[in-house]
């Protein structure tokens, strides 16, 4: 059976590869894909505490 790509990674992984504009880093398979293919967490209601920090998932600027 084919192993998932994450099964082949060492624990000390390098930082995510920068993605081109309009692409996002898929944290689950560790590569860049069109941002529209990924679903982000539901937005917090107004006034919710501590917004989530920027992550490698988001488009590169």
């Amino acid at each position: 059976m084919r192993r998932g790509p994450r099964s082949l990674r060492g624990r000390d992984a390098p930082a995510p590869t920068p993605c081109v504009p309009a692409e996002c880093f898929d944290l689950l398979v560790r590569h860049c894909v069109a941002c529209g293919l990924l679903r982000t967490p539901r937005p917090k209601p107004a006034g919710a505490s501590s917004p989530a920090p920027r992550t490698a998932l988001q488009p590169q600027e």
Epitope: R3, G4, R6, S7, R9, R11, A13, A15, P16, D26, L27, L28, V29, V33, G36, L37, L38, R39, T40, P41, R42, A52, T55, A56, L57
Partner: antibody
Framework: EVQLVESGGGLVQPGGSLRLSCAAS????????WNWVRQAPGKGLEWVGY???????YYNPSLKSRFTISRDTSKNTLYLQMNSLRAEDTAVYYC???????????WGQGTLVTVSS | DIQMTQSPSSLSASVGDRVTITCRAS??????????MHWYQQKPGKAPKLLIY???DLESGVPSRFSGSGSGTDFTLTISSLQPEDFATYYC?????????FGQGTKVEIK
Amino acid sequence: EVQLVESGGGLVQPGGSLRLSCAASGDSITRGYWNWVRQAPGKGLEWVGYINYSGTTYYNPSLKSRFTISRDTSKNTLYLQMNSLRAEDTAVYYCATPHTYGAMDYWGQGTLVTVSS
Amino acid sequence: DIQMTQSPSSLSASVGDRVTITCRASESVDDYGISFMHWYQQKPGKAPKLLIYRASDLESGVPSRFSGSGSGTDFTLTISSLQPEDFATYYCQQTSKDPWTFGQGTKVEIK
């Protein structure tokens, strides 16, 4: 709001086959990850596998290739084909979809599969 | 596979109590500075409900009495003041490496 509705569960004899369906609404199954998770009676949760936006599948190795996940994008429906069923496959089968970190924030109601002679 | 071990397996508590559940992974579930660790609540006959993702982020709509902490291999779910609707079974899950795995569950019962 994503809604997931499973169907196709029921009683099947050992060695038999069954195909479960999960109809999704509120989002396209051509984006994100679409999972099956099962729960034997009185037991914990066990991840079965997923199919993602590209059609890539990955399975729990403990299932030994007996299960196959597929999709019909025209129907926005996910499937779980289960072959060579055993008594220990008796469980409620849920479909679920996670957001970017793999946390499954939408779940179906589950469908019960009973493997018994 | 990454093994997830929850403790305790069950506990009895009263309304208003502070409850702590721990989950230990057999190897680190961190990558890119993110902990791929999530917590769910499940009530009998119902599907699981996501409470906490990425170790400490509260899912939208979940009461603030739930919180999560930890990194690497050791994680904690805390209910600051247990409410009647919180009596349920709680599961941790890692999505750092395939196959994704769950803890065995912690059942929170009424004392």
